[in-house]
């Protein structure tokens, strides 16, 4: 039921996460974990925020996006084989069993021989910043919403084909906003 | 040392209110997501409530959030449950226990407990 | 909601014995399980953790193991302060329900 992401051995890896703060500045805790998401906070965490900055992370593990705007997609740096897994993001909004909690999945292949000395474009950059989710309990498939510029037959099969990172660059080259949930 | 102490409980009319609390010693309470958990004599446990570190965040069981509200006072280092509405199905012992998840952890589970408090509804 | 069953309900065994109990859930709680030990009259104690890390104390006889929705508690050579009820509980959603319990009786 997890969404799927992948990356190749080396390169950097991008678990999209996003929330909308309630204000500019407004931030909610959120924590990213090793493993799917338990019924409180992350396990395994390896990056954790609080309502000013990141307050706790791990090497390799960082968030390239601006935070304070609610962008909290982890990067894992020069990714290896061990990185694969479920990973979950934790938007711990207060009040009453009101956390979102996201498991995504992370596949990583053996890094593709390329004889041409051609630059790859970093996974990270591949993927579209415009990516917004909404909450699901962790045995929940996560479903696509609202697409612009997209057409319906589209919609089915976009999960996967988000692993693809041609597509991803251009939905982002499209100005696609993408909604999941 | 862990100490968890609940306060007393007592006899309490049906479509009463009530509230219990539980003192914490021996550890730093704002660490701790905590926990109430209740017992009806001779029967098995049942999770209530639970609250994180900061009283910000709550859970509950759903037949009870309408009527029970957990919180705490990290500066008197105490957790409360406040019941109202109570039925005589709310008869229990209930206990405060801690949870042992740590921060950058990932570690689940009660590691300690109160020594319970007793709560009989009843006209 | 995620349903622990629990089995056996009772159990009696001697002491020196090795007893085992389980736990299924009725769905994927991903290792977020715990095991406690309760005696009569008093509260509840923390034996196991993430379904396997014993908790501080706890006597290495003592074991747990399982994934998934398939979770035991192990206890060897059991000694007398062993005998009480034993409760699993998850720790993967809301409710954190427990199992109904395994009492654990001297034969």
């Known amino acids: 039921s997890e969404v799927e992401y992948r990356a190749e051995v080396g390169q950097n890896a991008y678990l999209p996460c996003f929330y909308t703060p309630a204000a500019p500045g407004n931030l909610v805790p959120v924590c990213w974990g090793k493993g799917a998401c338990p019924v409180f906070e992350c396990g395994n965490v390896v990056l954790r925020t609080d309502e000013r900055d990141v307050n706790y992370w791990t090497s390799r593990y960082w968030l390239n996006g601006d935070f304070r705007k609610g962008d909290v997609s982890l990067t894992i740096e020069n990714v290896t084989l061990a990185d694969s897994g479920i990973y979950c993001c934790r938007i711990q909004i207060p009040g009453i069993m009101n956390d979102e909690k996201f498991n995504l999945k992370l596949v990583i292949k053996p890094a593709k021989v390329t004889p041409a000395p051609t630059r790859q474009r970093d996974f990270t950059a591949a993927f579209p910043r415009m990516l917004t989710t909404r909450g699901h309990g962790p045995a929940e498939t996560q479903t696509l919403g609202s697409l612009p510029d997209i057409n319906l037959t589209q919609i089915s099969t976009l999960a996967n084909e988000l692993r693809d990172s041609r597509l991803a660059n251009d939905l982002r080259d499209s100005g696609a906003t993408i909604r999941i949930g | 040392e862990v100490k968890l102490v609940e306060s007393e409980g007592g006899l309490v009319q049906p479509g009463s209110s009530m509230k219990i609390s539980c003192t914490a010693s021996g550890f730093t309470f704002s660490d701790y997501y905590m926990a109430w958990v209740r017992q009806v004599p001779e029967k098995g446990l049942e999770w209530v409530a639970n609250i994180n570190y900061d009283g910000s965040r709550t859970y509950y069981l759903d037949s009870l959030k309408s009527r029970f509200i957990i919180s705490r006072d990290n500066a008197k280092n105490i957790l409360y449950l406040q019941m109202s509405s109570l039925k005589s199905e709310d008869t229990a012992t209930y206990y405060c226990?801690?949870?042992?998840?740590?921060?950058?952890?990932?570690?689940?589970?009660?590691?300690?407990w109160g020594q319970g408090t007793s709560v009989t509804v009843s006209s | 909601d995620i349903q622990m069953t629990q089995s056996p309900a009772s159990l009696s065994a001697s002491v020196g014995e090795t007893v085992t109990i389980t736990c299924r859930a009725s769905g994927n709680i991903h290792n977020y399980l715990a095991w406690y030990q309760q005696k009569q009259g008093k509260s509840p104690q923390l034996l196991v953790y993430n379904a396997e890390t014993l908790a501080d104390g706890v006597p290495s006889r003592f074991s747990g193991s399982g994934s998934g929705t398939q979770y035991s508690l192990k206890i060897n050579s059991l000694q007398p302060e062993d005998f009480g009820t034993y409760y699993c509980?998850?720790?993967?959603?809301?409710?954190?329900?427990f199992g109904a319990g395994t009492k654990l009786e001297l034969k």
């Open positions: 509980q998850h720790f993967w959603s809301t409710p954190l329900t």
């Open positions: 226990a801690r949870n042992i998840y740590y921060y950058g952890g990932s570690s689940y589970g009660m590691d300690y």
